[in-house]
């Protein structure tokens, strides 16, 4: 239990089009040092959804204050969900490296499905 684990508790989240989707993720440790990133899909073709360290992600907000000391909650909320957002989202811990950070451990994934907007 000492080594960092990535907890993505929900296997599946269903959201109506136009609403926000909350994707939960937490780490069991602050070590190793390095950023968290969220991806849609796995493997080489995965899409970056959020990078804790850098970048502009206008539809993504963090659920808790990531600058807070000892914060282990890296959940995100994605606004204005559309059917194109459906897929499996992975919360991934990276280990700080030089020159590049190295992927350390991934969560098990959360499948996001999108329901038609209620009429």
């Amino acid at each position: 239990e000492d080594e960092l684990q990535v907890i993505q508790p929900e296997k599946s989240v269903s959201v109506a089009a136009g609403e926000s989707a909350t994707l939960r993720c937490a780490m069991t440790s602050l070590i190793p040092v390095g950023p968290i990133m969220w991806f849609r899909g796995a493997g080489a073709g995965r899409e970056l959804i959020y990078n804790q360290k850098e970048g502009h992600f206008p539809r993504v907000t963090t659920v808790s204050e990531l600058t807070k000391r000892n914060n282990l909650d890296f959940s995100i909320s994605i606004s204005n969900i559309t059917p194109a957002d459906a897929g499996t989202y992975y919360c991934v811990k990276f280990r700080k490296g030089s020159p590049d950070d190295v992927e350390f451990k991934s969560g098990a994934g959360t499948e996001l499905s999108v329901r038609a907007k209620p009429s």
Epitope: Q5, I7, Q8, K11, T28
Partner: antibody, heavy 123, light 113 residues
């Protein structure tokens, strides 16, 4: 060896509230998922809700929404389930259970259970 | 909510014979990304809390005798006790652990014929 020890039996009046505790020993409490399950006399198992202390917020079955509050105190490794507006149909054994997972996999079942707390609602 | 339907409600089987319990979920509990079914089976004896027997539909929990086996995928699942022993008399429950609320089946009481 993980253990869950629950508080003792309670007898309550209709309309009152009951708060049941579940103290964990062993393992890392903050990353546990603790579920509460109840069983009325001669009946089946009913999932009421659960909490993962590391996230802080609980989720509840619709049937109990607004009447049940599940909390966790990481400093004492204790989870709590409070049920309000009690009625005779709430007479049951209430169990806490730890949901289990392997490394960074999903939670997949409840592998450690408390001994159960009998709550009797009677006027 | 996902509705779990167990059958039969009760089952009487001779010692050494096979016992089969069925469980049907109202929607799939298969997580496609890892091809695992989030379906668990529990055994409960009178006056005791439930005990986890099977998870991921077919993986035996540590210490569970190999006469217990689980099968199925998607929405249809089966728990089999290949050779019923006296200590297997209990109520058996399936539970989906895919989407909260993590609903249980109604239970199947297994007795000796």
């Amino acid at each position: 060896q993980v253990q869950l020890v629950q508080s003792g039996a309670e007898v309550k009046k209709p309309g009152s509230s009951v708060k049941v505790s579940c103290k964990a020993s062993g393992g890392t409490f903050s990353s546990y998922a603790i579920s509460w399950v109840r069983q009325a006399p001669g009946q089946g198992l009913e999932w009421m809700g659960g909490i993962i202390p590391i996230f802080g917020t609980a989720s509840y079955a619709q049937k109990f929404q607004g009447r049940v509050t599940i909390t966790a105190d990481e400093s004492t490794s204790t989870a709590y389930m409070e049920l309000s507006s009690l009625r005779s149909e709430d007479t049951a054994v209430y169990y806490c259970a730890r949901e289990t997972r392997q490394d960074s996999a999903h939670y997949y079942g409840m592998d450690v259970w408390g001994q159960g707390t009998t709550v009797t609602v009677s006027s | 909510d996902i509705v779990m339907t167990q059958s039969p409600d009760s089952l009487a089987v001779s010692l050494g014979e096979r016992a089969t319990i069925n469980c049907k979920s109202s929607q799939s509990v298969l997580f496609s990304s890892n091809n695992k079914n989030y379906l668990a089976w529990y055994q409960q004896k009178p006056g005791q809390p439930p005990k986890l027997l099977i998870y991921w539909a077919s993986t035996r929990e540590s210490g569970v005798p190999d006469r217990f086996s689980g099968s199925g995928s998607g929405t249809d699942f089966t728990l089999t006790i290949s050779s019923l022993q006296a200590e297997d008399v209990a109520v058996y429950y399936c539970q989906q652990h895919y989407i909260a609320p993590f609903t249980f089946g109604g239970g199947t009481k297994v007795e000796i014929k």
